[in-house]
Amino acid sequence: YKLVCYYTSWSQYREGDGSCFPDALDRFLCTHIIYSFANISNDHIDTWEWNDVTLYGMLNTLKNRNPNLKTLLSVGGWNFGSQRFSKIASNTQSRRTFIKSVPPFLRTHGFDGLDLAWLYPGRRDKQHFTTLIKEMKAEFIKEAQPGKKQLLLSAALSAGKVTIDSSYDIAKISQHLDFISIMTYDFHGAWRGTTGHHSPLFRGQEDASPDRFSNTDYAVGYMLRLGAPASKLVMGIPTFGRSFTLASSETGVGAPISGPGIPGRFTKEAGTLAYYEICDFLRGATVHRILGQQVPYATKGNQWVGYDDQESVKSKVQYLKDRQLAGAMVWALDLDDFQGSFCGQDLRFPLTNAIKDALAAT
């Protein structure tokens, strides 16, 4: 099985124990590590952070002691903007310049492949996204002709049904991608006005969502029905939780909220907590399991957080094995307890290790 793990370059800027550099990663934990994110400047793939080249080097030296480890560079992301991707993909010259710029950039900096993180193609971009993937793959095949190992091509796709329908020709893009990471999280957010888990495995009776699509099981099944081969589908598992501020004394699933939860001490983003911050939060909190959805949530005062723990990730791994998927994807290594100092187990990357162990179990 693949264990595809994202590392985010901006995690270096978190203060104190939240700061994570690639040299803190475990070289034997994941089969693939994806560095997020690269930029596109003037139709050319490029660095984003001032010290990206140094961090690329740190990441790729992990392969010195584990030659089986593959590293990819992810281009795009939330801050990149869909419009910028759209302009590049829809113009033949821009798209082809971008594609041509990729192999030498990846080779120079020691990466084994490219991950496309266009979040998200619009309805008019669907065909262009397919063309981008098809032409990129053709370039990778051609570039590898002089006896080089072919560069890998993957994409991170939304798990939301509406986005899947408007953005992706699943059957076509699946032909050209080496694997597809389905982002089976962020199903539920503060915009709903109620509490709810952002990454439930199943819908469950407790689900207050207005639809039956906002869960991992539906998204995976839908992708498979649309023609994604199970052998290429990698299922996303978050090492972060989504939090809410409760608006009343109700604390269950579907309780009214006044907005996102208070920012974490290190991640400093309202409504989001890293797993290592959740471990802190759990001291003195009340933990509940949403039985049908097979995921936990915790409450403390007026704060509510839905997250994944070692038990829920094992359930998710068992599920992906039952569906004969290619493996699991983790967003993100730097949100797990990467130092092993927060979650009281004396174990670095406890969630990712639980996923790895479950994947290896017979």
């Epitope: 050319h44 490029d46 080249v53 120079t108």
Partner: antibody, heavy 116, light 111 residues
Framework: QQLKESGGGLVKPGGTLTLTCKAS????????VCWVRQAPGKGLEWIGC????????TYYASWAKGRFTTSKTSSTTVTLQMTSLTAADTATYFC??????????WGPGTLVTVSS | DVVMTQTPASVSEPVGGTVTIKCQAS??????LAWYQQKPGQPPKLLIY???TLASGVSSRFKGSRSGTEYTLTISDLECADAATYYC????FGSGAVDSPFGGGTKVVVE
Amino acid sequence: QQLKESGGGLVKPGGTLTLTCKASGIDFSSNVVCWVRQAPGKGLEWIGCIDTDDFIGTYYASWAKGRFTTSKTSSTTVTLQMTSLTAADTATYFCARGDAGYYALWGPGTLVTVSS
Amino acid sequence: DVVMTQTPASVSEPVGGTVTIKCQASQSIGSYLAWYQQKPGQPPKLLIYYASTLASGVSSRFKGSRSGTEYTLTISDLECADAATYYCQCSYFGSGAVDSPFGGGTKVVVE
């Protein structure tokens, strides 16, 4: 792995000349081949490039468009056709092979003199 | 269009010294900057690409760095063989190609 330019020489103003860039030990599959010139005692001036597998085609400096045309004539040969030449075009012309806009391999250059 | 301004036009340093050449891009070109060395009667030779990556076979005495839109080539432990003219180049290509990608050049004299 070598590149060699040929076809330079003396040409009258208003005349036409075709330079050839020949590769030995390599072919031009999936490479960008570019032309750069250097007037006597001056700096480097980019003319234009061709993507030899025609994925991104040809592209030129704005001043060279229409008067300079680069083509791939075989797997190891690229040409640069220059028309309406003036004394200002007197220079050593280099061809260079690039992966991503930077040129790792250069020919020794060929001198073009435009004079009556 | 991007304009590359290279300074100084010439510099003289003794053997063993250090030379710093700067190249200012008129707008952001990210890491798409290359440095070349050219000796009289010879074609240019690639030294650095992607702003800081050393080309194959080039001495580690040559170092490229970037700060915003300013790029620097540093030559340390200067040798007589380093006497040459150095050029920076915006290495955008295809749809991103710029009209005048080369800087004006810096002549390095080794005393």
